[in-house]
Interface confidence: medium
């Protein structure tokens, strides 16, 4: 089927368009182009007879049209009036006619737009500003940019007038920005120069600096005032309500007690017509007063609270000193002094931080000390301890248990047997016990001030038979080649033999294994990772025998010399480098990397994307085991071959 394709479809004024003919039939006599959607002799542009290769202009010919032997029509130097439909009339040799219609649209090349504004100096929180993009152009799309970004979503921003007008309601100082508009049509796009919005605001409440309010007689008083404002504020100072001067700074040399009083700074914005004031009260001392300590927390809770102790009063140009337990301050990461030394902060207080604390003010001849302050640190209760430590009793004896937990204020105690409350006392006494008194004995300690509770449970067995023993250890995480471990078989019982097994075998002969305390204690000297085995103890007498559950020793070791994988040392430019480091260690070590001595990330895997010869060098993996306190490292050299595509990666 005969079709017309316009190339391009959207044409800029002054450019050219080609009406391209597709599927032109064979055996043609000639063809004619017409302006419009039908064949109309009055609107003929040009005709062409194939036999003579003769082109004949028609009434609508403008001199800008060229017809080609393949029937395509080129129109040059396009004008707005050229928009519309064009019809090709084909006359075949058999005099059967065929027609096809195509079209194109003409758009003007857009001029550079500009922004007009209805308010060049809007006032914050009061005025609205309407920006309009000029000129108004038909068939154009309008876009807006703020600081070269597209418009943010905001209820204060509104587009209207076909997006040609941008209105900012209730402007704020944050609307001070670069605004641009852009016009677009299918053939061109133009952006305006930027317009900077100048929002008038303030003054905000002024701030007076420095913040000190106490001074000594003879010092200079130098106060500065600042308030955010556009245009910048004009400042005035008043002392006790009396105007002093119109400056941003107030300077009074060699002050006396008579200079004590209220100092007011007034900030004024001549454009917005607004005034704001701030008052500070200045005290001038003839001599430094006796200092005293204030605390932001009189009953801090251990491991929870921080306490800030402040030495009062605040006096300009004064040296503050502190003592704890009648000693100068110890070096501790939990003790922090403010820049002027006036505030001592104890981070995460402990029960050992009670004090006493004293502060002092240095004067010309001596140091004035405050009265001592003692902190009442609330702590505990710690895990209560139940004594005596026996867990195995014979029938007929008296059971007397005592409970104690470190706590401030002192703990309140309760006893439970098999979960049932017995009494609210520190001691529990049961006479002439029987096997029915076997069970779980719980001591509960409660601190009413901190609200914390802790419990300890002890299993009491009353039996003529031996109980199942258990193993206690003096070191649950010993370090290889350094620590010793003492295992003790519980409970302690009279006329009893103690036995030991390792991994189900009787004890091997070794100078590092030692039995003591009637074979009840097994000590391993200089543990190694191979000692991480299952240990079982047994007790036996003439009536019965029993074995403990196994206890597996968790030996901390390493880190051993690390291994970097993959082993490759040469890479191609553009590859991603992915090095993994591994070291035998318990617990798992912390990994870090250095490249040519420069610290990198603290990860087991080092990843660098798109390496180049600049990545050549030494890659060191460092491993550290915080539990053993040991470190190790290994270094690997990496070579990167240059890219074949100079000067680098193409995009």
């Amino acid at each position: 089927k005969l079709t017309i394709e316009s190339t391009p479809f959207n044409v800029a004024e002054g450019k050219e368009v080609l009406l391209l003919v597709h599927n032109l039939p064979q055996h043609l006599f000639g063809y004619s182009w017409y302006k419009g959607e039908r064949v109309d002799g009055n609107r003929q542009i040009i005709g062409y007879v194939i036999g003579t290769q003769q082109a004949t202009p028609g009434p609508a010919y403008s001199g800008r049209e060229i017809i080609y032997p393949n029937a395509s029509l080129l129109i040059q130097n396009i004008i707005q009036n050229d928009t519309g439909f064009y019809t090709l009339h084909v006359i075949k040799s058999d005099l059967v006619n065929e027609e096809a219609t195509g079209q194109f649209r003409v758009y003007p090349e857009l001029p550079k737009p500009s922004i007009s504004s209805n308010n060049s100096k809007p006032v914050e929180d009061k005025d609205a500003v309407a920006f309009t993009c000029e000129p108004e152009t038909q068939d154009a799309t309008y876009l807006w940019w703020v600081n070269n970004q597209s418009l943010p979503v905001s209820p204060r921003l509104q587009l209207s007038n076909g997006n040609r007008t941008l209105t900012l309601f209730n402007v704020t100082r944050n609307d001070t920005a670069s605004y641009k508009c852009e016009t677009q049509n299918p053939v061109s796009a133009r952006r305006s120069d930027s317009v900077i919005l100048n929002v008038l605001y303030g003054p905000d409440a002024p701030t007076i600096s420095p913040l000190n309010t106490s001074y000594r007689s003879g010092e200079n008083l130098n106060l500065s005032c600042h308030a955010a404002s556009n245009p910048p504020a004009q400042y005035s100072w008043f002392v006790n309500g009396t105007f002093q001067q119109s400056t941003q700074e107030l300077f009074i040399p060699n002050i006396t007690v008579n200079n004590s009083g209220s100092y007011t700074c007034q900030a004024h914005n001549s454009d917005t017509g607004l005034n704001r004031t701030t008052v500070t009260t200045i005290t001038v001392y003839a001599e430094p007063p006796k200092p005293f300590i204030t605390s932001n927390n009189s009953n801090p809770v251990e491991d929870e609270d921080a306490v800030a102790l402040t030495c009062e009063p605040e006096i300009q140009n004064t040296t503050y000193l502190w003592w704890v337990n009648n000693q100068s301050l110890p070096v501790s990461p939990r003790l922090q002094l403010s820049n002027d030394n006036r505030t001592l902060t104890l981070l995460s207080v402990t029960r050992n931080d009670v004090g006493p604390y004293e502060c002092g003010i240095q004067n010309k001849l001596s140091v004035d000390h405050s009265d001592p302050v003692i902190l009442n640190v609330l702590y505990g209760p710690d895990d209560p301890t139940i004594s005596p430590s026996y867990t195995y009793y014979r029938p007929g004896v008296n059971l007397s248990l005592s409970c104690h937990a470190a706590s401030n204020p002192p703990a309140q105690y309760s006893w439970l047997i098999d979960g049932n409350i017995q009494q609210h006392t520190q001691e529990l006494f049961i006479s002439n016990i029987t096997e029915k008194n076997s069970g779980l004995y719980t001591c509960q300690a409660n601190n009413s001030a901190s609200g914390h509770s802790r419990t300890t449970v002890k299993t009491i067995t009353v039996s003529a038979e031996l109980p199942k023993p258990s193993i206690s250890s003096n070191n649950s995480k010993p370090v290889e080649d350094k620590d010793a471990v003492a295992f003790t078989c519980e409970p302690e019982a009279q006329n009893t033999t103690y036995l030991w097994w390792v991994n189900g075998q009787s004890l091997p002969v070794s100078p590092r294994l030692q039995l003591s305390n009637g074979n009840r204690t097994l000590t391993l000297f200089n543990v190694t990772r191979n000692d991480a085995r299952a240990y079982v103890c047994g007790i036996q007498n003439s009536v019965s025998a029993n074995r403990s559950d196994p206890v597996t020793l968790d030996v901390l070791y390493g880190p051993d010399t690390p291994i970097i994988s993959p082993p490759d040392s040469s890479y191609l430019s553009g590859a991603n480098l992915n090095l993994s480091c591994h070291s035998a260690s318990n617990p798992s070590p912390q990994y870090s990397w250095r490249i040519n001595g420069i610290p990198q990330q603290h990860t087991q895997v080092l990843f660098i994307a798109k390496i180049t010869p600049n990545n050549n060098g030494t890659y060191a993996c460092f491993v550290s085991n915080l539990a053993t306190g040991r470190n190790n490292s290994i270094v690997k050299s990496i070579t990167v071959s240059a890219s074949g595509t100079s000067p680098g990666l193409s995009a």
């Epitope: 490759d568 040469s570 430019s573 590859a575 480098l577 798109k610 071959s641 240059a642 595509t645 193409s650």
Partner: antibody, heavy 120, light 106 residues
Amino acid sequence: QVQLVQSGAEVKKPGASVKVSCKASGFNIKDSYMHWVRQAPGQGLEWMGWIDPENGDTEYAPKFQGRVTMTTDTSISTAYMELSRLRSDDTAVYYCNEGTPTGPYYFDYWGQGTLVTVSS
Amino acid sequence: EIQMTQSPSSLSASVGDRVTITCRASSSVSYMHWYQQKPGKAPKLLIYSTSNLASGVPSRFSGSGSGTDFTLTISSLQPEDFATYYCQQRSSYPLTFGGGTKLEIK
């Protein structure tokens, strides 16, 4: 499992261009480099270059520089290789390969190949 | 560009034979990969980084070498091993392949 499925055979005239596609499945195309290797009839293998689908970075063999363009559309997990200004000696089977970004640039997954014939 | 020369270019052998194919690089390379290709099929990775067996490849295939000289060895030829074998270097752009060794049944 990893699969690379390439577009069908093409016949082109000298001077024309050809664009071969390679659809990946069974892995995230952004995690790999896509390489292209060709093999002329009865001849050996010839590496053409790679593209990083994550950001469009490329590395081309100098022989093909200026004639080859490698692109990807990660939304449909497809890589493309376009070779322009074709000559008769460009007649070959073109393979796409998946390669790990960390080197060592060996090819364990290959497309089935696309035969491009250049003939007047 | 690193040139890769494979030898021999073709060789005849019998089932059960031990076969060695050599690949020589025009300058030193760090690693070599080896591929097997059967007619009408895409190549298949056999050995990567000189000596590592690719997944699913029988243990009768092995690789060795360093610097400029590398070898692929088939310890005991099986009927399915008759194919063309290519080496490939990965140390310098452009990546280059050897010209191939065609292994035929004697």
